[in-house]
């Protein structure tokens, strides 16, 4: 039988990772609900310990014994200002055992004290049993990865911790080493590297500076704000909307816990849709007193909300060069860890201070640490897989790459066995009159919605200057060099403003036999797929159409060519087709077809009559032949036929 | 004035063939779209589809995809149905009718008989 | 499929007396941009082609005589004739065009 693998956990603060390296590769691993994080959060009840998802999901209820936040405590005094601080915030009650901290809980009718240790050996217990539900066989070998500034006593009692929960703790890294190491950045091969690694998770911010030179890495700084993350972001929107919801029902809800964390969890799960999209709605029913709240808010304004706590992020960055005694362009790479870097406007931030540079974010910044401990594992396992020390090369793109258009159509710039390297460009525009940006979303995957496929990684391309729908020209190239390192760019054409990602191969991607899977459904669902393309195809087009037909009878040059009943015939049929639209997105391929050919039946005579006898051809962009491809309330993008 | 007259309907049997034409006059041919209904004996009217006059864009109902076909000649003023594969139960009075805001202006309509 | 249900199938009045013909569709015509609701009525004479009454619901179509209205808005819709006349005995026919185009089984109305 082959030798047990060892496993790497990140032990985090407000949720915690596990990952293994086997069959060349890094397995984030999932827990029992599916989730590849699970909450370090354990809850005490009169029947039983829970730890998890189950012990965050019944916190509400069951406040002063539900324990978070253990790695705040652990291998600290009791006295210590931090501790005596925290205190402050938590709902559950922290007693004094000879100067050490200790959680007092009742638990099965009984109270219960437990060291932090004991804890955080529950969290990594769980840990332990979700590698072990997945691999089949029991583990015991682990590497546990905590905060560069955590000292001795910290890194000892979290060792402890994993005794405790029956593991053989191979070593303690750096959680900010364990990032470099999953971007492989201790093996570029080109001497001495600084790394700055900007970690913000859901209760700390964590800015590390490490220098690595021949496989050896150095900490020279750290900065950051031990209580700065998602969490706080959560209280601002908790905040705004417990306002709104004063303003709209004269209630202040503030003093409901229920309705308080129930509006949390809502507010939580927005701020993560507005990563990925410039709207999130909320809906809760019976929030308060019976009263549904059904609100939305933008990425915008989120984005205010949070201003002064995304521009503080900065400030130790700054800190941290001047301790490291660096400037900022001797930084050679940056590297993202941490969900709440998932935010565009804190990525821009710190993308902007470093005047552009390319951020490594291709692997989930969530797991990013986890991905990093488990290839440590592995080394100190004495895995001589090649993968372990280098790389995998690819020669061939093993999925077509693409990006999503418009519905939520998969547009391939880069066919599935492509040799590479390779590089392809196309043509985009905008979805809507005077969008200010595009949203690239980069995918992997052989099915016709990108729902159903691999996403990679997404960036914004922004300042596009006011235009009707359709008038501008986003060039989207994918380069893929002999590494399999994908690099997209999208560059708008009439300013030369360009936008890019760098998503690296065997990163958060799909294994030979998930490629080989989805390869085969592709097969099998090619059929349905294929109706669901020409269905959003002829939605797109009848929605192109319209738009157009209506901006071309609008248009000031047309005045005194285009008679008032024939415009207002034109306008009243792109009125009825739009609105119809908007009530009819889930409508058969049929249904949009025919409307657009009614639409063509009504506009085309009357647009043709205008340009007969002008010497030129019909106007540009009037066919039928629309977009192919919108779904979120992201910036869309469409493709140019 | 607008003038629809349908023609080519007759006696064919199951399996068979017929190409039923409509000419429109009195208007723009292009300018309107033309449908396609159909009446059984004794039946009610049943929609069988129409064809965008502009473009030559048919669309079917669902009943009539596969063997029924639209066409136009707009340097006539044409319409036209060609059926394949007929069956007894295609026997029917077949009208064109000019679509507006509705079906403003219909044929006289032409008899479709399928037996053996 | 947008499926229209008429009733009655038939109905006798007297001459000069109101008549009333239901239209039920499976899902709403209304198109709330326009505001207006996508149905009209034909009316088919004995061996004669269907003729166009009334659109959008309440549209009279020209030439029409104006004892022939349409009411209703959503799923549900009525012709009625006010004053019958002889030359009305006919069958009327509803049709949706709200999404492709279906017609309403028919009623047949006759003098009582």
């Known amino acids: 039988m082959a030798k047990a693998a060892a496993i790497g956990i990140d032990l985090g603060t407000t949720y915690s990772c596990v990952g293994v390296f086997q069959h060349g590769k890094v397995e984030i691993i999932a827990n029992d609900q599916g989730n590849r994080t699970t909450p370090s959060y354990v809850a005490f009840t009169d029947t039983e310990r829970l730890i998890g998802d189950a012990a965050k999901n019944q916190v509400a209820l069951n406040p002063q014994n539900t324990v978070f936040d253990a790695k705040r405590l652990i291998g600290r005094k009791f006295g210590d200002p931090v501790v005596q601080s925290d205190m402050k915030h938590w709902p559950f009650q922290v007693i004094n055992d000879g100067d050490k901290p200790k959680v007092q809980v009742s638990y099965k009718g009984e109270t219960k004290a437990f060291y932090p240790e004991e804890i955080s050996s529950m969290v990594l217990t769980k840990m332990k049993e979700i590698a072990e539900a997945y691999l089949g066989y029991p583990v015991t070998n682990a590497v546990i990865t905590v905060p560069a500034y955590f000292n001795d006593s910290q890194r000892q009692a979290t060792k402890d911790a994993g005794v405790i929960a029956g593991l053989n703790v191979l070593r303690i890294i750096n959680e900010p080493t364990a990032a470099a190491i999953a971007y492989g950045l201790d093996r570029t091969g080109k001497g001495e590297r600084n790394v700055l690694i900007f970690d913000l998770g859901g209760g700390t911010f964590d800015v590390s500076i490490l220098t690595i030179d021949d496989g050896i890495f150095e900490v020279k700084a750290t900065a950051g704000d031990t209580h700065l993350g998602g969490e706080d972001f959560d209280n601002r929107l908790v905040n705004h909307f417990v306002e709104e919801f004063k303003r709209k029902h004269k209630k202040d809800i503030s003093q409901n816990k229920r309705a308080v964390r129930r509006l949390r969890t809502a507010c939580e799960r927005a701020k993560r849709t507005l990563s990925s999209s410039t709207q999130a709605s909320l809906e809760i029913d019976s929030l308060f007193e019976g009263i549904d709240f059904y609100t939305s808010i933008t990425r915008a304004r989120f984005e205010e909300l949070c201003s002064d706590l995304f521009r503080s992020t900065l400030e130790p960055v700054e800190k941290a060069l001047r301790d490291a005694k660096l400037d900022k362009a001797q930084i050679h790479d940056l590297v993202l860890v941490g969900g709440s870097t998932r935010i565009p406007k804190v990525q821009k931030l710190l993308q902007d201070f470093f005047n552009g540079r390319d951020l490594n974010k291709s692997i989930n910044p969530d797991e990013a640490v986890a991905y990093g401990a488990a290839v440590q594992a592995a080394i100190l396992m004495g895995d001589k897989s090649e993968n372990v020390q280098d790389l995998l090369l690819l020669d061939v793109a093993p999925l077509s790459l693409g990006l999503e258009t418009a519905g939520g159509v998969m547009t391939a710039l880069i066919k599935r066995n492509s040799t590479i390297p390779t590089k392809q460009t196309q043509i985009f525009t905008t979805y809507s009159d005077n969008q200010p940006g595009v949203l690239i979303q980069v995918y992997e995957g052989e099915r016709a919605m990108t729902k159903d496929n691999n996403l990679l990684g997404r960036f914004e391309l922004s300042g596009i200057p006011p235009a009707p729908r359709g008038v501008p020209q986003i060039e989207v190239t994918f380069d893929i060099d002999a590494n399999g390192i994908l690099n997209v760019t999208a560059t708008d054409k009439s300013t030369g403003k360009a936008n890019k990602i760098t998503i690296t191969n065997d990163k958060g991607r799909l294994s030979k036999e998930e490629i080989e899977r989805m390869v085969q459904e592709a097969e099998k669902y090619k059929a349905e797929d294929e109706v669901q393309r020409e269905r959003v195809s002829a939605k797109n087009a009848l929605e192109s159409y319209a738009f157009n037909m209506k901006s071309a009878v609008e248009d000031e040059g047309l005045k005194g060519k285009i008679s008032e009943a024939d415009k207002k015939k034109v306008l009243d049929k792109c009125q009825e087709v739009i609105s119809w639209l908007d009530a009819n997105t889930l409508a058969e391929k049929d249904e949009f077809e025919h409307k657009r050919k009614e639409l063509e039946q009504v506009c085309n005579p009357i647009i043709s009559g205008l340009y007969q006898g002008a010497g030129g051809p019909g106007p540009g962009g009037f066919g039928a032949q629309g977009p192919k491809g919108g779904s979120g309330s992201g910036p869309t993008i469409e493709e140019v036929d | 004035e607008v003038q629809l007259v349908e023609s080519g309907g007759g006696l064919v049997k199951p399996g068979g063939s017929l190409r039923l034409s409509c000419k429109a006059s009195?208007?723009?041919?292009?300018?309107?779209?033309m449908n396609w209904v159909r009446q059984a004996p004794g039946k009610g009217l049943k929609w069988v589809g129409w064809i965008n006059t502009y473009t030559g864009e048919p669309t079917y109902a669902d009943d009539f995809k596969g063997r029924f076909t639209f066409s136009r000649d707009d340097s006539k003023n044409t319409l036209y149905l060609q059926m394949n594969s007929l069956k007894t139960e295609d026997t029917a009075v077949y009208f064109c009718a000019r679509y507006d805001h509705a079906m403003d202006y219909w044929g006289q309509g032409t008899s479709v008989t399928v037996s053996s | 499929e947008i499926v229209l249900t008429q009733s009655p199938d038939s109905l006798a009045v007297s001459l000069g007396e109101r008549a009333t013909i239901n239209c039920k569709s499976s899902q709403s015509l209304l198109n709330s941009g326009t505001r207006k609701n996508y149905l009209a009525w034909y009316q088919q004479k004995a061996g004669q082609s269907p003729k166009l009454l009334i659109y959008?619901?309440?549209t009279r179509e020209s030439g029409v005589p104006d004892r022939f209205s349409g009411s209703g808005s959503g799923t549900d819709f009525t012709l009625t004739i006010d004053s019958l006349q002889a030359e009305d005995v006919a069958v009327y026919y509803c049709k949706q065009s709200y999404t492709l185009y279906t017609f309403g089984g028919g009623t047949k109305v006759e003098i009582k």
């Open positions: 959008w619901t309440s």
């Open positions: 009195g208007y723009t041919f292009t300018n309107y779209g």
